[in-house]
Amino acid sequence: HTAAQDNCTCPTNKMTVCSPDGPGGRCQCRALGSGMAVDCSTLTSKCLLLKARMSAPKNARTLVRPSEHALVDNDGLYDPDCDPEGRFKARQCNQTSVCWCVNSVGVRRTDKGDLSLRCDELVRTHHILIDLRHRPTAGAFNHSDLDAELRRLFRERYRLHPKFVAAVHYEQPTIQIELRQNTSQKAAGDVDIGDAAYYFERDIKGESLFQGRGGLDLRVRGEPLQVERTLIYYLDEIPPKFSMKRLT
């Protein structure tokens, strides 16, 4: 099914406009901003979601040390260019003709340049490290229970195949979720780790992208897991190319 048939809405993306104008009167949904048709049985790509967001009214155990090549999304929101499949185009430019290259999750991986900047290919982000700090609790969560609960969440809520959740680390109050997905591992129909991480990030911030589903209520054996800080690191299959001046 492409969308909820009974009331013609998109369960996996509330930033859509839906109408029963598909083949045979089927419900069809299009993303705001781009007008692209979306498959409502799975997550919408981060690129289309960012584009929709920019078009919306403007109201309102041993922990992993990220590698030297890990990227953090410091640039924040921008209005991206998406390809016909909804993926980020390798080169992104703003209205003032400033351009840069991005990875498959839309995070800048080069210095900014002008229109002559070339981005030969969209470099895949194959490893995502989600770093969370939870609010104080009476005691530490049981590691195995926490691990299982987060794996269940990514399977059930985001439809991410269990093989892509590489590890869950916990050193109270820090939780780290490692997602890994090489190009060769990702089969047709598999949810992309970048999309799953983005939905999770928005859920954690209380900005759920799901239609008609309650917000994220994370519990470990009934004990609420409340996140007070999130940092996401992105590792690409090819290391990013920044000049030394950025590092100083």
Epitope: A4, R151, E156, H161, P162, R213
Partner: antibody
């Protein structure tokens, strides 16, 4: 073809332990989850817990915690569920089932465990 | 724990009848799953994500609902449909099943 083949029926005395095996074929074992469900005679389905085969992460329901142990041998693509301190109420058919982005997509044929003095 | 209550617990119907089984959850769930079980056999996945038919399942089966109320419908009963049906949720641990609905020949 995805297959889950379980071990044969068992008869145990109260207080004993039983270990049920579930041999998988037709898929990459460590990419999936194996859940365990039981069904007492003439009754409904009851979930026991699950094991993530790649990481060894396990979740048991509170009812069985302390009495159940789930393990996996990746070299033989076999999952195991051991239940200890058996009582007559544990008489049931025990099923293993594969989990992916669905909770249970393929099921084993079931193993009847009879607890009787 | 989320309790699932199926209605009715048993049902007698004839070939060709339209049959509806409901499943009510004690708190809101994202999706419902339905299984069919025949005597002496393992359950078989029938419907996932509330309304999507599993591979090989005939189109006479359909599922609907949201939140706490879900429905399984068989539009025209066939002889092979007489079995027990279970709903199941996994929106939170522990996964739970309904008590089952036994569909018998009238």
């Amino acid at each position: 073809e995805v297959q889950l083949v379980q071990s044969g029926p068992e008869v145990k005395k109260p207080g004993a332990s039983v270990k049920v095996s579930c041999k998988a074929s037709g898929f990459t074992f460590t990419d999936y989850v194996i859940g365990w469900v039981r069904q007492a005679p003439g009754q409904g389905l009851e979930w026991i817990g699950e094991i993530y085969l790649g990481s060894g992460t396990i979740y048991y329901t509170q009812k069985f915690k302390g009495r159940v142990t789930m393990t996996a041998d990746t070299s033989t693509s076999t999952a195991y569920m051991e239940l200890s301190s058996l009582r007559s109420e544990d008489t049931a058919v025990y099923y293993c089932a594969r989990g992916s982005i669905f909770p249970f997509d393929y099921w084993g044929q079931g193993t009847l465990v009879t607890v009787s003095s | 724990d989320i309790q699932l209550t199926q209605s009715p617990s048993s049902l007698s119907a004839s070939v060709g009848d339209r049959v509806t089984i409901t499943c009510s959850a004690s708190s809101s769930v994202s999706y419902m799953y339905w299984y069919q079980q025949k005597p002496g056999k393992a359950p078989k996945l029938l419907i996932y994500d509330t309304s999507t038919l599993a591979s090989g399942v005939p189109s006479r089966f359909s599922g609907s609902g949201s939140g706490t109320d879900f429905t399984l419908t068989i539009s025209s009963l066939q002889p092979e449909d007489f079995a027990t049906y279970y709903c199941q949720q996994w929106s939170s641990y522990p996964y739970t099943f309904g008590q089952g609905t036994k569909l018998e020949i009238k």
